[in-house]
Each structure stands twice: as C-alpha cells, then as structure tokens.
Amino acid sequence: ARNGDHCPLGPGRCCRLHTVRASLEDLGWADWVLSPREVQVTMCIGACPSQFRAANMHAQIKTSLHRLKPDTVPAPCCVPASYNPMVLIQKTDTGVSLQTYDDLLAKDCHCI
Amino acid sequence: ARNGDHCPLGPGRCCRLHTVRASLEDLGWADWVLSPREVQVTMCIGACPSQFRAANMHAQIKTSLHRLKPDTVPAPCCVPASYNPMVLIQKTDTGVSLQTYDDLLAKDCHCI
C-alpha cells in the first residue's frame, strides 16, 4: 500500500529513484568484471516523511513510533521496491561468462 | 547474501531486531482496533557499516558508493528481511472481526 506520492518537503526531496554513474573501480569490481566499464546505477534516495510511499503496515507503524520516540525509532527508510535485472561479463577460472543479476539495479522505491 | 554478522561498531550498535512496546493510541489504532491493547512491535534498528548483513548486490554497491560519495549516496539502511504475522481484533460496521496481517512485525533484519 503505497500511501502518498506527494512530497511535503518539496520536489525531488522525498524517496525516489536516482541514477549514479559508477566505474568498475568505484564499485570494487575491476578484478572480476570485464564489462561494462561503467554502470548507470539506479538507487533509492530521499526522505520518507509521514506516510510517503509507505510500503506496508510496518512502515506506517514505524512512522507513528518515530513521531513519538524520534531518538529510539528511526523514520522509515527509502529502499528498492523492485529491481531491474542486469548482465555482467565476468571473469571465470577458465575465461569469461555472461551472468545475469536480478538484484543490482533498483527499479522503483518505497519507504519501509 | 548476508555478508558479515560481526558488528564493528560494538555490541548491539548494528542493524538488528528491537522490540518497542506501543499502545493502540501510540499507533493511532484506537479507533479501529479492539485488541491487543498493547503491541510488542519488533522492528529493525541500527547502523549498516560496510558489508554488515548486506541483503544483496545492490546493498554492496550502495556501501561502495557511499564510501566514495557520502553526501550523495546514503549508507544502506536497516530494514526487515521478513515478517511475522499478527492478528488484530478489529471493529467492523457490524461488529468485530479477527484479521491477520502479514507485514506488521519484523522477523529478521538486513541492510539494503
């Protein structure tokens, strides 16, 4: 149940998909990945104010308790709701293989 | 792939399951839930240092990019990996019903 999609903090400030360009070196992959040399990493970044894109009942509880006990209970966090698959050309003991990873790139985001 | 379970920040400081006692009033449920009057809410709280309980490849990427660009990319976040179901006795138009919720109580935690 993704509750609200209106961000009360202003445009682009709340939990949403961002793209970050990263090299194999940035990712620490240079020793085992041959291609791509650079990845457009999609990730979930932004604030999770009250009921914004609440993933489930747990997220709603977290919002309520954070309001009551902000020092004890953190606000919900912006994380992937689903992923886009991606292939990597990776080194193997004998050469290379094309491997699919289902959990690399965020597809959309929610707060939990 | 839950990488490390050793917390480099000291015992209890990293992402783990916590229990927070909350009343129906705390949760904003008093108008639609009859029982329980109080809930032992299990939730995921704590830091996610490098590779600690990394949920997947995305979490590992996030760790690497946070190290490089801490102002742009946040560290992974401590969220539920799974949930325990819970029943609520809730008010209905005609009386009460016993309803099971599968996404209320965190069962275990990981970093993502």
Epitope: L34, S35, P36, Q40, N84, P85, M86, V87, L88, I89, V96, L98, T100, L104, L105 | -
Partner: antibody, heavy 118, light 107 residues
Framework: QVTLLESGGGLVQPGGSLRLSCSFS??????????VGWIRQAPGKGLEWLAH???????YFNTALKSRLTISKDTSKNTVYLQMNSVRAEDTAVYYC??????????WGQGTTVTVSS | DIVMTQSPATLSTSPGERATLSCKAS??????VAWYQQKPGQAPRFLIY???YRYTGVPARFSGSGSGTEFTFTISSLQSEDFAVYYC?????????FGGGTKVEIK
C-alpha cells in the same frame, strides 16, 4: 536455454523492402546490458554486421547501410525486427540475429535466407 | 570503419597439429577482438572475447592473444571437429567489423 529464430526471408524484388523478425527465448530485452544484433553472410562470403538494438532502445547501424536499415523491438513479444529498404542483388544473403551482452554476441539463430531477384 | 585482415585465407593441416591464425586491425583496438568458428550450413559459434578470454564451455585447446593491431588465435592440437572457418571481429567501436575468415582444412 537461450534460443533465437529468424523469419521473414524469401524472394524479394530489387527495389523492394524486406522485414525480418527475430523471436527469442531464454533472455529478456529489458535486462540492462542485453541487446540483439543482425549479421548477414552473402553466399560464399564472410560475416557483415548490420545493426543492433539495446535494452534501452539505443540503436547502432552499419555505416554503409544506415540509410536503408530500421531496427526495432517489441520487448513484450521477445521479438526484434530488421527492415531493409531499396534492396538490391548484393543484399542476397543468410541473415542471422544474435543475442548480445555488451560487446559479446554469444548466441546466434540458424539464419533466414533472403534472395533478391526479379 | 576499422578493417580487420585475416591470414592465411586457408590453412591446410592435420589432426593433432597446432594451428595459428593471424588477424590485423587497421587501427589500435586495444584487446577488443573476438573469435568465432563457423561450420558449413551452421551459424557462427562464439569462442574468444577480448583477445584472450575463452567463453563458457569453450575447450582449453582454443586460445587467443594480442593487443593493439596484431592478434593471434591458436588451436593447440586440432581435433576433427575443429576443421571450419574462423573469423575475428573487433568489438572496440561500432560499426563492428569482421575479418574475411580463415578456413582450416584437412591436409
């Protein structure tokens, strides 16, 4: 497992156009890094790369043939199409499609034969 | 466009022998050269990526080397099933281009 199957070949009149289809299974064209390419081989000759299309709809074409080629995809149908206009006798060839992962062309179809003749 | 030139056009040799094929690029392509095998009536089979990396399932008797403009493909000990046409291809930049092929035939 990965399979590709070309169709749409046959006899084409000079000056006409051809539309080839490549139906595939075992992979998805919505996967980052995946593409489908077209390569042809004239009778008794070598291989000639024609075009390819990526998961993000980026397209690349053989320089000499660019003006005559169109490539498109239907991700939901797992199909890639190649259209060639103003065909001539020298376009007679076996046309292959291949699965691509970045710059790897690792799986190929068995090819469809196109004959340009009046 | 980058021109890939293979030599020899035909290599006549015997089973058990070593076969060495050459491929030259018209400009520097770093290590971005692939090799394919094609048998009559069949589609090409992908063998070598980025000059020297064998693809999954390719036997160890196939190997590649080189960088810049000069590349070599070697079959250490020819098996009967290895007699075929071999193509090099540059994957450094589009348009991707193939060499003319080397036919490895039984002597």
């Amino acid at each position: 497992q990965v399979t590709l199957l070309e169709s749409g070949g046959g006899l084409v009149q000079p000056g006409g156009s051809l539309r080839l289809s490549c139906s595939f299974s075992g992979f998805s064209l919505s996967t980052y890094g995946i593409g489908v390419g077209w390569i042809r081989q004239a009778p008794g000759k070598g291989l000639e790369w024609l075009a390819h299309i990526w998961w993000n709809n980026n397209k690349y074409f053989n320089t000499a043939l660019k003006s005559r080629l169109t490539i498109s995809k239907d991700t939901s149908k797992n199909t890639v199409y190649l259209q060639m206009n103003s065909v001539r006798a020298e376009d007679t060839a076996v046309y292959y499609c291949a699965r691509m992962g970045y710059d790897i062309m690792d799986y190929w179809g068995q090819g469809t034969t196109v004959t340009v003749s009046s | 466009d980058i021109v890939m030139t293979q030599s020899p056009a035909t290599l006549s040799t015997s089973p058990g022998e070593r076969a060495t094929l050459s491929c030259k690029a018209s400009q520097d392509v770093n290590t971005a050269v692939a090799w394919y095998q094609q048998k009559p009536g069949q589609a090409p089979r992908f063998l070598i990526y980025s000059s020297s990396y064998r693809y999954t399932g390719v036997p160890a008797r196939f190997s590649g080397s080189g960088s810049g403009t000069e590349f070599t493909f070697t079959i250490s000990s020819l098996q009967s099933e290895d007699f075929a046409v071999y193509y090099c291809q540059q994957h450094y930049s589009t348009p991707w281009t193939f060499g003319g092929g080397t036919k490895v035939e039984i002597k």
